[in-house]
């Protein structure tokens, strides 16, 4: 299953399959997730080691048993790949690292006014993988405001150095935020020239394209079909690059197919997995296990559940079957692709779905009334769980926020439905940033069921929580995916990085905002909060957040939206925007429904509604 916990001061011994430099443990974990053989990783921050060569070292590891012995190492961070972790699988990494220079091939230098502008330039340059920016206080005046665009053979820095007044980060192309746009066209009977960066075997051109998309240096590809004249070269997928970023030439060639990486697509990237099953095809590779199962789909599920399995072949040969079950060969290779592809066999083959980010049809958890006042504009994909709950009567308007917690589930505040309990009048918009982008053609979700907490009473602040079941499940994308829920009764975690988001009023007597707003707000203890609200009872099922001096808060129209906190690199839904005295007033924190206190209720309702378990447990 999915394991998300990180081990502080621990280093996995042995099992090394690759090593690289990464700026933090989260990026190291992402590289592990996308490496075909990596199950575990260990990361050495600069503070954990004196050896300059090993600083920022990210060590990717494999293990036949799925685990390795941990040795104590002060400052080291270790953890698991996020394979099998559904919507948490993403190659998108937005963080900017201050005081760090990520080294690579510098191929472009320009003057820009901010690190954000530098990141944008990198994202909009086809060859840029990461960048460094010298701030206005950099010690050498001639380098100030320099934006260096970089690449490397592996897509990660060739070295990382601690350097004052330098900020570094990665291209946001994997976040589907590139302005370049992409070529969706595939060209039959055409071969591209230029430099081959890798060679893999794939059953069709689509798999070849997806592998190219997620390969750090692939910009375009040529695939030799199963009809290619030279048998030994059939099904070869050549991943390519060039200095210019485009093919320098193409040659008409029967039985070849060429195309481009889709990494520069805006708003939508292909999933990093291949779900199609290929009948009459055998995938060769190293044998991991052989099991008898009923049907090729069960074989694929078995492969997906066995974390080291990369692909499979389900044999229908009479000697491989007994009763209704046949042999399911679970296989792997060094690069994650079959070492041999044979056609016209009595087998059906396919790939593990361990990197599919759709996950199962569940809500996500972890084991271990109201623009935002004083906020700033959010950017695309920053808060992909945020939804807008709108009511369509004569006109249509935004009333509340909500949080996507599963393919078919939204969590919001019960008071959003005061006087409007009719599910037919509601429209739920997900994957949006600007309310003005909503037109009559914008897709929306309708409500199948509104589940208001049984103890909620109108005009009271208690149990202000409601679940919405959508009529149809939503697909996950970089702009529309769920927020993980905390564990039941989560009281031990100290959250220091919390944010509230919404389209609500920017001042008490304001109006709904167009661009989704965000504000960073510290949590306040319940004791402190109770002192500020002596006329109300602040219960343990509430959580408060705000600045003593006020100025930043949720407001009308943000209700039902999320209070999220980042812990160990993972966002969790800590609260639901509920109520407060005015907005952003001095010594009047916002009050939120504490989600951890309602985990039993959430699980009960999301499970009983379908009659089957809806929980997915990444840890």
């Amino acid at each position: 299953g999915c394991l998300t916990q990180l081990y502080e001061n621990a280093f996995f011994r042995g099992g090394d399959v690759a090593s690289m430099y990464t700026p933090n443990a989260q990026y190291c974990q992402m590289r592990c997730t996308f490496h075909p053989r990596c199950l575990l990783f260990s990361f050495l921050p600069a503070s954990s080691i004196n050896d300059m060569e090993k600083r920022f070292g990210c060590f990717l590891k494999d293990s036949v048993t799925g685990t390795l012995p941990k040795v104590h190492r002060t400052g080291a961070v270790s953890g698991h790949s996020l394979k099998q972790c559904g919507h948490q699988i993403s190659a998108c990494h937005r963080d900017i690292y201050k005081g760090v220079d990520m080294r690579g091939v510098n191929f472009n230098v320009s003057k820009v006014s901010s690190v954000e502008e530098c990141q944008k330039r990198c994202t909009s340059n086809i060859r840029c993988q990461f960048f460094s920016y010298a701030t206005q206080t950099f010690h050498k005046a001639e380098y100030r405001n320099n934006c260096l665009l970089k690449y490397s053979p592996g897509g990660t820095p060739t070295a990382i150095k601690v350097l004052s007044n330098v900020e570094s980060g990665f291209s946001l192309k994997p976040c589907a935020l590139s302005e370049i746009g992409c070529h969706m066209n595939i060209f039959q009977h055409l071969a591209f020239s230029d430099v081959d960066v890798a060679r893999v075997l794939t059953p069709d051109a689509f798999v070849c394209r997806t592998i190219c998309t997620y390969h750090p240096n692939c910009l375009f590809f040529t695939f030799y079909t199963n009809v290619w004249k030279i048998e030994s070269q059939r099904n070869v997928c050549l991943l390519k690059t060039s200095e210019s970023g485009t093919p320098s030439s193409s040659t008409p060639q029967e039985n070849t197919i060429s195309g481009y990486s889709l990494l520069t697509c805006k708003r939508t990237l292909p999933e990093p997995c291949h779900s199609k099953i290929y009948p009459g095809v055998d995938f060769g590779g190293e044998e991991l296990n052989v099991t008898f199962v009923k049907g090729v789909n069960v074989c694929q599920e078995t492969c997906t559940k066995m974390i080291r399995c990369q692909f499979f072949t389900y044999s229908l040969l009479p000697e491989d079957c007994k009763e209704e079950k046949c042999k399911c060969f679970l296989r792997l290779s060094m690069d994650g692709s079959p070492t041999r592809i044979a056609y016209g066999t009595q087998g059906s083959s396919g790939y593990s779905l361990r990197l599919c980010n759709t996950g199962d049809n569940s809500v996500c958890t972890t084991k271990t009334s109201t623009r935002i006042v004083g906020g700033t504009n959010s950017s695309w994909g920053e808060w992909p769980w945020q939804v807008s709950l709108q009511v369509k009567l004569t006109a249509q308007r935004h009333l509340c926020g909500g949080s996507l917690i599963g393919h078919q589930w939204v969590l919001t505040a019960a008071h959003c439905f005061d006087g409007l309990p009719l599910q037919d009048v509601w429209r739920i918009y997900s994957g949006i940033l600007n309310l003005s982008d909503i037109t009559k053609d914008t897709p929306f979700s309708q409500i199948k069921e509104i589940i208001i907490h049984q103890n909620y009473k109108v005009s009271e602040g208690n149990h202000d929580i409601a679940l919405i079941k959508l009529q149809a499940p939503l697909n996950y994308t970089e702009f529309q995916k769920p927020i993980c829920l905390p564990s039941k009764g989560d009281t031990s975690t100290i959250y220091t990085n919390c944010w509230v988001t919404g389209w609500g009023f920017s001042k008490e007597k304001g109006e709904i905002q167009n661009i989704l707003q965000k504000v960073n707000i510290p949590l306040v203890t319940n004791e402190e909060c109770q002192k500020r609200y002596q006329d109300y009872k602040i219960t343990q099922r509430m959580v408060c957040a705000g600045y003593k001096e006020g100025g930043k808060d949720a407001c009308k129209g943000d209700s039902g939206g999320p209070l999220v906190c980042k812990h160990n690199g993972m966002w969790r839904l800590v609260g639901i925007t509920s109520w407060g005295e005015g907005c952003a007033r001095r010594e009047q924190p916002g009050v939120y429904t504490k989600v951890a206190e309602y985990m039993d209720w959430i699980l009960e309702k999301t499970q009983s509604s379908d009659g089957k378990a809806q929980m997915q447990s990444p840890a």
């Epitope: 595939i186 039959q188 069709d204 689509f206 695939f223 197919i257 292909p270 199609k276 009459g280 056609y343």
Partner: antibody
Framework: EVQLLESGGGLVQPGGSLRLSCAAS???????IMWWVRQAPGKGLEWVS?????????QYADSVKGRFTISRDNSKNTLYLQMNSLRAEDTAMYYC????????????WGQGTLVTVSS | DIQMTQSPSSLSASVGDRVTITCRAS??????LNWYQQKPGKAPKLLIY???SLQSGVPSRFSGSGSGTDFTLTISSLQPEDFATYYC?????????FGGGTKVEIK
């Protein structure tokens, strides 16, 4: 130039049999997956059967499974469809088609042969 | 089995019109989608493969888009020879299935 030419259609009584042929030219037939697709009069397209290049793997729509058999003779560049236990609902124009290699679908079609099942 | 739902089933348009036909799959089929044109008494002809790629010899006024479950065939400026029936087809899994067809008629 790729060409596919079907033959063997005609009028047959329910329960009867027919063998359709598709002669291929203009490409290396032995390397390609080949398909049969049919179209009932005034209706849409329906996939019937497929066969891999070596003939070692075949697939059928549920509606014809157990009654129809697809085969090929690579030395003669010919695809066949043996149709037994024919029913009135098998009445259709039958097309043979070549696999769109590496992508799926059908890039070349024959002109079709009409099969009428009627008493 | 994957169901392919095409809409509209028929439409009337004039020469020069922009025509859009949609196709929806009952489950995600990635980009494994093809479009065909069929004229009365003729075999179908491949127009678009891989959801958006134009088959060789097909006029550029035809274009395809979409991925996952929702796909579109667009004829930017309808010509007299474009009056025909159009079918979408998924090649994601067997049984290979077609949409019900869209008949484009002269207004």
């Amino acid at each position: 130039e790729v060409q596919l030419l079907e033959s063997g259609g005609g009028l047959v009584q329910p329960g009867g049999s027919l063998r359709l042929s598709c002669a291929a030219s203009g490409f290396t037939f032995s390397r390609y997956i080949m398909w049969w697709v049919r179209q009932a009069p005034g209706k849409g397209l329906e996939w019937v059967s497929g066969i891999y290049s070596s003939g070692g793997y075949t697939q059928y729509a549920d509606s014809v499974k157990g009654r129809f058999t697809i085969s090929r003779d690579n030395s003669k560049n010919t695809l066949y469809l043996q149709m037994n236990s024919l029913r009135a609902e098998d009445t259709a124009m039958y097309y043979c088609a070549r696999e769109l290699e590496g992508l799926g679908g059908f890039d070349y079609w024959g002109q079709g042969t009409l099969v009428t099942v009627s008493s | 089995d994957i169901q392919m739902t095409q809409s509209p089933s028929s439409l009337s348009a004039s020469v020069g019109d922009r025509v859009t036909i949609t196709c929806r799959a009952s489950q995600s089929i990635s980009s494994y989608l093809n479009w065909y044109q069929q004229k009365p008494g003729k075999a179908p002809k491949l127009l678009i493969y891989a959801a958006s790629s134009l088959q060789s010899g097909v006029p550029s006024r035809f274009s395809g888009s979409g991925s996952g479950t929702d796909f579109t065939l667009t004829i930017s400026s309808l010509q007299p020879e474009d009056f025909a029936t159009y079918y979408c087809q998924q090649s994601y899994s067997t049984p290979l299935t077609f949409g019900g067809g869209t008949k484009v008629e002269i207004k």
